[in-house]
Amino acid sequence: LQDPCSNCPAGTFCDNNRNQICSPCPPNSFSSAGGQRTCDICRQCKGVFRTRKECSSTSNAECDCTPGFHCLGAGCSMCEQDCKQGQELTKKGCKDCCFGTFNDQKRGICRPWTNCSLDGKSVLVNGTKERDVVCGPSPADLSPGASSVTPPAPAREPGHSPQ
């Protein structure tokens, strides 16, 4: 015998109190598949969460985070605060990047400045907390009468401090 509830489409539920008639989901609830015996309560996007997509009878609401926060977790289950450029988020809040490191985004960690000398280049623009250094031509290229042939880059050695 076929289950009469299997005929109930998404957006309805099989109402046992009414001889298994397919009843529409009540307000603020949904069923995303057919044959459901109950409808699920819609997610509410409150506080630091804001509504990205309204709940409908066939699909749950979707949340994202208010400005100043970004989503974490499946389906944006959590909101993590943004930091300013030049900072990183630590367990105790936003902290400025240490000297020699930078972060050009509102999330993530501070990264060391590029070490230009590892590629045989000079520093063209100094780094800041918000920006990496800009490497220029190699010192040899800047000397008068220098050959246009770029010398091979030295082998990378571990442990060089950023410059």
Partner: nanobody, 124 residues
């Protein structure tokens, strides 16, 4: 598949206690530091406490120091958070999280897996 499942949340009166548990599966539990993080209504994530893989190093947010105790039982693949002297401001969804290495600190977030969370409500 790595999974973290929190339990133990509920409604408690101010000054009361609760113990949260986090059952871990899908990875070698003792090799990784673990962290509790919470999200109060209308607020962003707040780090609560972290413990190293071996359990010998623990760290706490100033807001919970002296009231909360983090611990782990590596033989049961379970993380705990004992919460005493609870206050209204401790009301939040509490998430258990796996860090990426065995060591931890009170500085970097190094979280790569989150649980689904358990709700703690402190109210009279």
């Amino acid at each position: 598949e790595v999974q973290l499942l929190e339990s133990g949340g509920g409604l408690v009166q101010p000054g009361g206690s609760l113990r949260l548990s986090c059952a871990a599966s899908g990875f070698t539990f003792s090799n990784y530091a673990m962290t509790w993080v919470r999200q109060a209504p209308g607020k962003g994530l707040e780090w609560v406490s972290s413990i190293s893989g071996s359990g010998d190093s623990t760290y706490y947010a100033d807001s919970v120091k002296g009231r909360f105790t983090i611990s782990r039982d590596n033989s049961k693949n379970t993380l705990y958070l004992q919460m005493n002297s609870l206050r209204a401001e401790d009301t939040a969804v509490y998430y258990c999280a796996k860090e990426g290495t065995g060591t931890t600190s009170d500085y970097y977030y190094n979280v790569d897996v989150w649980g689904q969370g358990t709700t703690v409500t402190v109210s009279s």
